[in-house]
């Protein structure tokens, strides 16, 4: 299809590195969200990190190419790495405008499926571009 | 600053495969841009034809698809275009460019190429 | 595609006259607001170079006599005031859909 994708763009404070890269930041007239349009792809990822109490944006935007699971239309996340004990990072990449603003749902820390608590640990920058 | 060179033949055989190479100096192609090809005809009407992405990744005109091919050299820092089949429809001015965004800000000089018997 | 037409082809003005150029496009070529339309200039050998991105951004190192405006089909490009360096063929690209395609262009001619 000819028509570009849009994606919610926004990194938090401390993130190493950066997606803006990826896309041309939109004018929406409000400070946020902000909205990017994908230049190499038509798919949208967004990160979260889970503690045992709240889950936290940590990047949203578009993706390099268009890879498995970009086909989805919704954010449903899959966990991929382990910041720091009691945290996990999850991950969603989809296909439709905006789909990255918000995920579906989020298995409870803990819960089968998510890699145990002695997985991977890295240092927080690092650890997005690892769920990356 | 960024600076982009084409080179390649002048004179390419009707139904052969035209080849040209953009050398980029200034800017890495993998750290960023789309690295494009866009040609100008005879009666200065401009086409884009494709581009390979800082990753990679390439998207082409559809109306070239079937016979358009965007390659690169990283160790070079050198991007290439080979068009198959080729007609006296395909002379041009050749050009590669760089894009940071969907415009162009990054241009060669160019490079004529003539198809001819 | 979308068709960009241009009007005029060519346009004859004096130095110091106001020129406008306008660029009609099949469809929109806005996202969300944005006009994805840019403009170009083009001497005789030379490779175009680009004025105005975004309909209405102007390009670092470019006069500020010319200026970009429009939205969604209908967008216009203005030299306030054509210096002698000016005249040229001027282009509009779009950028809202693949592939990207540009105007047929507008020749400027001394009058």
């Known amino acids: 299809p000819p028509n570009r994708r849009t994606c919610v763009f926004f990194e938090a404070p401390g993130v190493r590195g950066s997606t803006k890269t990826l896309g041309e930041l939109l004018d929406t007239g409000t400070e946020l969200p902000r909205a990017i349009r994908c230049l190499y792809s038509r798919c949208c990822f967004g990160i979260w990190n889970l503690t045992q109490d709240r889950a936290q944006v940590e990047m949203q935007g578009c993706r390099d190419s268009d890879e498995p699971g970009c086909e989805s239309l919704h954010c449903d996340p899959s966990p991929r790495a382990h910041p720091s004990p009691g945290s996990t990072l999850f991950t969603c990449s989809c296909g439709t405008d905006f789909c990255n603003a918000n995920y579906s749902h989020l298995p409870p820390p803990g819960s089968p499926g998510t890699p145990g608590s002695q997985g991977p640990q890295a240092a927080p920058g690092e650890s997005i571009w690892m769920a990356l | 600053q960024v600076q982009l060179q084409e080179s390649g033949p002048g004179l390419v055989k009707p139904s052969e495969t035209l080849s040209l190479t953009c050398t980029v100096s200034?800017?890495?192609?993998?750290?960023?841009?789309?690295w494009n090809w866009i040609r100008q005809f005879p009666g200065k009407g401009l086409e884009w034809m494709g581009y390979i992405s800082f990753s990679g990744s390439t998207s082409y005109n559809p109306s070239l698809k079937s016979r358009i091919t965007i390659s690169r050299d990283t160790s070079k820092n050198q991007f290439f275009l080979q068009l198959s089949s080729v007609t006296a429809e395909d002379t041009a001015v050749y050009y590669c460019?760089?894009?940071?965004?969907?415009?162009?800000?990054?241009w060669g000089q160019g490079t004529l190429v003539t198809v001819s018997s | 595609d979308i068709v960009l037409t241009q009007s005029p082809s060519s346009l004859s003005v004096s130095v110091g006259d106001r020129a406008t150029i306008t660029c009609r496009a099949s469809e929109s070529v806005d996202t969300y607001g944005n006009s994805f339309m840019h403009w170009y200039q083009q001497k005789p050998g030379q490779p175009p170079k680009l004025l105005i991105y975004r309909a209405s951004n102007l390009e670092s190192g470019i006069p500020a006599r010319f200026s970009g405006s429009g939205s969604r089909t209908d967008f216009t490009l203005t030299i306030s005031s054509v210096q002698p360096e000016d005249f040229a063929t001027y282009y509009c690209q779009q950028s809202n859909e693949d592939p990207y395609t540009f105007g047929g262009g507008t020749k400027l001619e001394i009058k």
């Open positions: 200034g800017y890495s192609i993998t750290s960023d841009f789309a």
């Open positions: 460019a760089g894009s940071r965004y969907s415009w162009f800000a990054y």
